[in-house]
């Protein structure tokens, strides 16, 4: 087999001739050297995951369910193409699994225990799966059979399919729980018929349900969804307000040399010649001889799941948590409104040992989880690996593309009542040495640049905002001659002046030497024409108050700041000399956890926070020798965000404004990821 | 209440070895932790390394391969093996656990 054949799997007889149709139209308008495709025949769908896993077969594709098998071990595969529905110019990858609800009705999401439920059927993915995975763990004991137990949950049901002999509590609102369309409560619009006649309490659907069923506005009004976090939204906020985010149709291929690019290089050529409205003698989206060979029949192209993008991310949080709450039937021994312990994201070794010391010390409210960088991280967090980190704006940013949630932002000044007031913000600044008395922010092109790394917001996000704005193009790296900024390509010239040894080069953690604010500014000390840190750090590295041989002897006097108006100024007239004005660091946590994440901390600091006088005897949670472990070392307290508790409050529209224009130069795989997901 | 008490330093040549140890008085030591210290003469209290009540272990960069911390609950005791040491090892070495204030600690002194 030439090495660009694709060797897709095919489920069934018919399923098989339109693979061989495929093969053999893709033959007839594709180059000898551009991708091909082979047929692999199996009895199932499991058997095509376990084949491709063992390198017999390349790619198949599967509705969520099963992506998330094919993601388990040993199968261990991955999204690599979406399926979409809609047009082009708004491909829909994805439905929203939805609670509806009447609006007078006055329950949420905790409080579903006795009222009556309306379901699309037994086994169905928006109608049964998820939500009765998501309630899984509030279901009376003994959970199996699972009828049974949800029988005894709700006060009554309709749960076309279900056995009514044996649960006839499932049958209650529909008498005999018919399997098909003659059943009046059947499907999706069964289920929403069921809950709009009275029979039901709630309805378990897709969020189109509502809209196809409804086209009345003010009809529609009379409905809300039940949202996670117990309250409720509008039927058309779904994006906010639903049980889970669920992928329609994809292809998997194997996580390690599975031929991603291939596939897609395949699919894309097969939607150009054979997609929707394009050819008469074959339609990859269409199955004469049954339904949804292939691919399904409503589809309307493909599109490329980013490379970062693992099935546990592409299924999201909510949706795994269902499914594995299905399979595995395991639920925590605590009760469910105790607070479990934390799990804090750590980069790399020196804060894991900082973690580690909060751990031991925190008497088992935080654990500890390591990443190799920030992004990482944010994903640990995203899957439920890891719960909590203390982000800078920019990643706050990425976090909150990611869903997660800001919950306390650090405070640099001391006051009165520091956790109750959240602080403006800090400066970014542009630093030099003095002695270079003949540069300014106008002629800064070709020198060497520091940066606290890619995508952080006073060392990248504010600087190359400004310096797009003036260049129109993203190469920073030829702006200047070479630079310092962790995480960049590793053979960017922005890597040429970083101080890590072999791996560790360039790498956005402490391993790298040059990293974060204290880095940049040792960076501009030893090699640099200018870094680009936050306002505190000349005086935080200068004076003797950093001990560290490099910053021992280092004076204040001898540093000058970059104004935006071509001037320079004393490092300490930052406030009218600076590049922007950046929000605080914040902790991001998923919703779910949002509230346990701020009980704790707030325990927490209030242990080992800025009233522990004596550092050296105790242990201090804002205190890491100038190198910003876990939280930056001038925080004087976590403060409450009272309504700015979503990414967009907390930054504000200018900065959000700013990383978005930012975007078109961002090489976060992560936030390309986070934005497939939501758009 | 439970009090520490560390003991097992003593001068050594560099690349020699020590076994520092920690007993604990009373009951419920290391339930969450122990982890042990170092000060040397004019610097800050650094941590060494430290062992959760699972076993878990991590330590510093600069001792990891060299330093093994373990524990034996039944003796109530959390012990130190030092092998290669150097000069800048040199220091006096506390065990800590949390809610117990910290000991008088062992002496350990490296000489080139």
């Known amino acids: 087999v030439p090495d660009k054949t694709v060797r897709w799997c095919a489920v069934s007889e018919h399923e098989a001739t339109k693979c061989q149709s495929f093969r053999d139209h893709m033959k007839s308008v594709i180059p000898s050297d551009g991708p091909s495709v082979a047929c692999v025949k199996k009895a199932s769908y499991l058997d095509c995951i376990r084949a491709i896993a063992a390198n017999e077969a390349d790619a198949v594709t599967l509705d969520a369910g099963l992506v998330y098998d094919a993601y388990l071990a040993p199968n261990n595969l991955k999204p690599v193409v979406a399926e979409f529905y809609g047009s082009k110019e708004d491909p829909q990858t994805f439905y929203y699994a939805v609670a509806v609800v009447k609006k007078d009705s006055g329950f949420q999401m905790n409080q579903l225990r006795g009222k009556k439920s309306c379901h699309t059927g037994l086994g169905r993915s928006a109608g049964w799966n998820i939500p009765i995975g998501l309630l899984y763990c509030d279901l009376p004991e003994p959970r199996k059979p699972l009828e049974k137990a949800v029988a005894n949950f709700f006060s009554g049901s309709c749960a076309p399919c279900a056995d009514g002999t044996d649960f006839p509590q499932l049958c209650q609102l529909c008498p005999g729980c018919g399997c098909s369309t003659l059943n009046q409560y059947f499907g999706y619009s069964g289920a929403f018929k069921c809950l709009k006649d009275g029979a039901g309490d709630v309805a378990f659907v897709k969020h189109s349900t509502i809209f196809e069923n409804l086209a009345n506005k003010a009809d529609r009004d009379q409905y809300e969804l039940l949202c996670l976090d117990n309250t409720r939204k509008p039927v058309d906020e779904y994006k906010d307000c639903h049980l889970a985010q669920v992928p329609s149709h994809t292809v998997v291929a194997r996580s390690m040399g599975g031929k991603e690019d291939l596939i897609w290089e395949l699919l894309n050529q097969a939607q150009e010649h054979f997609g929707k409205d394009k050819s008469k003698e074959f339609q990859l989206f269409s199955s004469p001889h049954g339904k949804d060979l292939l691919f399904k029949d409503s589809a309307h192209g493909f599109l490329k799941v980013p490379p970062r993008m693992d099935a546990k991310m592409y299924l999201g949080y909510e949706y795994v948590t269902a499914i594995r709450n299905l399979r595995e039937g395991t639920c925590p021994e605590a009760p469910t409104d105790e607070c479990k312990p934390v799990k804090w994201c750590a980069l790399s070794h020196h804060e894991r040992l900082k973690c580690d010391e909060w751990s031991v010390n925190s008497v088992g409210k935080i654990e500890c989880v390591s990443a190799e960088t920030t992004e990482d991280c944010i994903a640990k967090i995203m899957n439920g690996e890891a719960d909590a980190m203390s982000l800078d704006g920019g990643f706050v940013y990425i976090a909150g593309k990611c869903g997660l949630v800001p919950v306390l932002a650090e405070n640099y000044n001391k006051s009165d009542n520091c956790e109750d007031t959240p602080e403006a913000g800090y400066f970014a600044i542009a630093v030099v040495k003095k002695s270079a008395s003949d540069l300014t922010w106008d002629n800064l092109k070709g020198k060497k640049s520091c940066h606290t790394a890619v995508g952080r917001t006073a060392g990248w996000n504010i600087p190359m905002g400004l310096l797009y704005n003036k260049i129109n193009h993203c190469r920073f790296d030829e702006f200047f001659s070479e630079g310092c900024a962790p995480g960049s390509k590793k053979d960017s010239s922005l890597c040429k002046l970083c101080m890590g040894s072999g791996l560790n080069l360039c790498e956005p953690n402490n391993k790298e030497g040059y990293y974060g604010y204290t880095g940049a500014f040792r960076c501009l000390v030893e090699k640099g024409d200018v870094a680009f840190v936050k306002h505190q750090t000349v005086p935080q590295n200068t004076g003797g108050k950093n001990p560290d041989p490099w910053a021992k002897n280092l004076n204040e006097k001898d540093y000058e700041l970059l104004c935006l108006d071509g001037t320079r100024k004393p490092v300490e007239e930052y406030a009218n000399c600076h590049l922007a004005r950046a929000p605080n660091h914040a902790v991001v946590t998923r919703k779910d956890k949002e509230a346990c994440v701020h009980k704790i901390l707030r325990q927490q600091q209030h242990l080992f926070g800025s009233n522990v006088t004596d550092c050296s005897g105790n242990f201090c949670l804002f205190r890491s020798e100038t190198k910003d472990l876990l939280f930056r070392d001038d925080t004087v307290c976590l403060a409450k965000l009272h309504d700015r508790n979503t990414y967009e409050k907390y930054l504000g529209e200018e900065y959000v404004k700013a990383v978005g224009n930012l975007r078109k130069c961002s090489t976060s795989s992560l936030l390309e990821a986070c934005t497939f997901r939501r758009p | 209440q439970v009090k520490l008490e560390e003991s097992g330093g003593g001068l050594v040549q560099a690349g020699g070895s020590l076994r520092l140890s920690c007993v604990a008085s009373g009951s419920g030591f290391g339930i969450n932790g122990v982890i042990w210290y170092r000060q040397a003469p004019g610097k800050q209290r650094e941590l060494v390394a430290l062992i959760k009540s699972d076993g878990y272990t991590n330590y510093r960069e600069s001792v990891k391969g060299r330093f093994t911390i373990s524990r034996d609950d039944a003796k109530n005791t959390v012990w130190l093996q030092m092998n290669a040491l150097e000069p800048e090892d040199t220091g006096v070495y506390y065990c800590?656990?949390?809610?117990?204030?910290f000991g008088q600690g062992t002496p350990v002194t490296v000489s080139s």
């Open positions: 800590k656990t949390p809610g117990v204030p």
